[in-house]
Interface confidence: medium
């Protein structure tokens, strides 16, 4: 029996379900009396889910994954996994047995977006040409960690004075802070570019001075 | 096999400069999210920094190196490089080069180079 | 920045003994740690990562537990191999990543 996987890693939203691809090829007079399939952690070997002797034998990991019984007799190995989670990226093998045996690996890779911006001044009034001022990017709950990108009206990155941090929440998702300190022109708009590396998702935000009142 | 593999250490005098060059092989380089890691002698591991994949990379640094050290990669020599200027007595250390356990963040190291000796004397 | 406490310094143990260290964070990191083994002369090696998970190769022996503040790795069973500097590494909360000051096991 040879067991087909996809290549790539599997994408998956945060809170979305899932589906890991894996097929085998049933030889004719096949039936499901013959099938052992087991979904394991491919890192800690911790058992997923099973069927074997016949039958479905359910989920072994927080009751979040389910086979396609119907599908199983045409060699249809596939694990759907529902209300996806931080904790559950890595790898994940499917073994079939049926006379011969062979397994295959699959990646799961979660990713939340990034909220838009927040955008806060420090000082935020009596602002004037040559202050230095400290302005802040917020974004919430996005996952893997952000890439923070600063730009100032004419597209010109401002790479300087730049700190980013990343804490994870107790789900696992990620805020992200990046504050840039700039001395003032006469006017000016500051941009920050918050973005998911998985998803290709950009939010953005920023900030216009010019004079008063400020615009965010 | 995947492999790290770090070149560019040397005695320098302190406020000199020295670009350390680290070689990866076997793996998709422009994936990984890679750091620089150091060890003074015998002490331990210090986190000095690392790059992201995205735009050629966003660069982080510990506050003991920044302003003086740059962090850069070329993926199409997939080549991470440190460029280490106005050195100090308390940048000997051996220097490391690690790749991400899982592409697109940081998380642990899994490769590990085999290091280079920066010494700064005079 | 988060500072990671390892304890004890040192660790004196005898071949075949379970060997158990501490690493903790000044502030709750979830399971976002590490743990490395280096001996002399060479580059550290990953051990455990999201606290409890064993990376590629490395022998059932090596177990890591706790999550928050508190972690532990636990040799069950030390081989010759085992004598080295265990540091742990946090990844919740960066720039800048931390390792803990490490823990030396050696040879009662």
């Known amino acids: 029996v040879e067991v087909q996987v996809s290549e790539d890693p599997v994408v998956a939203l945060v809170d979305t379900d899932a589906t890991l691809r894996c097929s085998f090829s049933p030889e004719p007079g096949f039936s499901l009396a013959q099938l052992n399939l087991i979904w394991q952690l491919t890192d800690t070997k911790q058992l997923v889910h099973s069927f074997t002797e016949g039958r479905d034998q359910g989920s072994a990991y927080s009751n979040r994954t389910a086979l396609f019984p119907d599908l199983l007799v045409q060699g249809n190995a596939s694990l759907r996994l529902q209300r996806v989670r931080v904790t559950d990226e890595g790898s994940y093998t499917c073994f079939v047995s049926i006379q011969d045996f062979d397994s295959a690996a699959v990646s799961l890779q979660v990713a939340a977006p990034y909220s838009k911006p927040s955008m806060t001044l420090e000082p935020n009034k009596d602002l004037r040409p040559g202050n230095m001022v400290t302005i802040t990017c917020s974004s919430y709950q996005g996952y893997p960690e952000a890439e923070v990108f600063w730009k100032d009206g004419q597209g010109v990155p401002l790479t300087g004075n730049v700190t980013t941090s990343q804490m994870a929440n107790e789900r696992g998702l990620f805020d992200v802070h990046s504050v840039l300190r700039v001395v003032l022109g006469a006017n000016g708009t500051y941009s920050c570019l918050v973005r998911n590396p998985v998803l290709q998702q950009d939010a953005h935000g920023s900030v216009t001075i010019t004079g008063q009142p400020l615009t965010f | 096999e995947v492999q790290l593999l770090e070149s560019g250490g040397d005695l320098v005098q302190p406020g000199g400069s020295l670009r350390l060059s680290c070689a990866a092989s076997?793996?998709?380089?422009?994936?990984?999210?890679m750091s620089w890691v150091r060890q003074a002698p015998g002490k331990g591991l210090e986190w000095v920094s690392g790059?992201?994949?995205?735009?050629?990379?966003?660069?982080y640094y510990a506050d003991s190196v920044k302003g003086r050290f740059t962090v850069s990669r070329d993926n199409s020599k997939n080549t991470l490089y440190l460029q280490m200027n106005s050195l100090r007595a308390e940048d000997t250390a051996v220097y490391y080069c690690?790749?991400?356990?899982?592409?697109?963040?940081?998380?642990?190291?899994?490769?590990w180079g085999q290091g280079t000796t920066v010494t700064v004397s005079s | 920045e988060i500072v990671l406490t390892q304890s004890p310094a040192t660790l004196s143990v005898s071949p075949g003994e379970r060997a158990t260290f501490s690493c903790r964070a000044s502030?709750?990191?979830?399971?976002?740690l590490a743990w490395y083994q280096q001996k002399p002369g060479q580059a550290p090696r990953l051990l455990i990562f999201?606290?409890?998970t064993r990376a590629t190769d490395i022998p059932d022996r090596f177990s890591g537990s706790g999550s928050g503040t508190d972690f532990t790795l636990t040799i069950s069973s030390l081989q010759s191999e085992d004598f080295a500097v265990y540091y742990c590494?946090?990844?919740?909360?960066?720039?800048?990543?931390?390792f803990g000051g490490g823990t030396k096991v050696e040879i009662k």
């Open positions: 502030q709750t990191i979830g399971n976002k």
């Open positions: 790059i992201s994949i995205s735009y050629g990379g966003n660069a």
């Open positions: 590494q946090q990844y919740n909360n960066w720039p800048p990543l931390t």
């Open positions: 690690g790749r991400d356990r899982s592409p697109y963040q940081y998380r642990s190291m899994d490769v």
């Open positions: 076997g793996f998709n380089f422009s994936s990984y999210w």
């Open positions: 999201s606290a409890s």
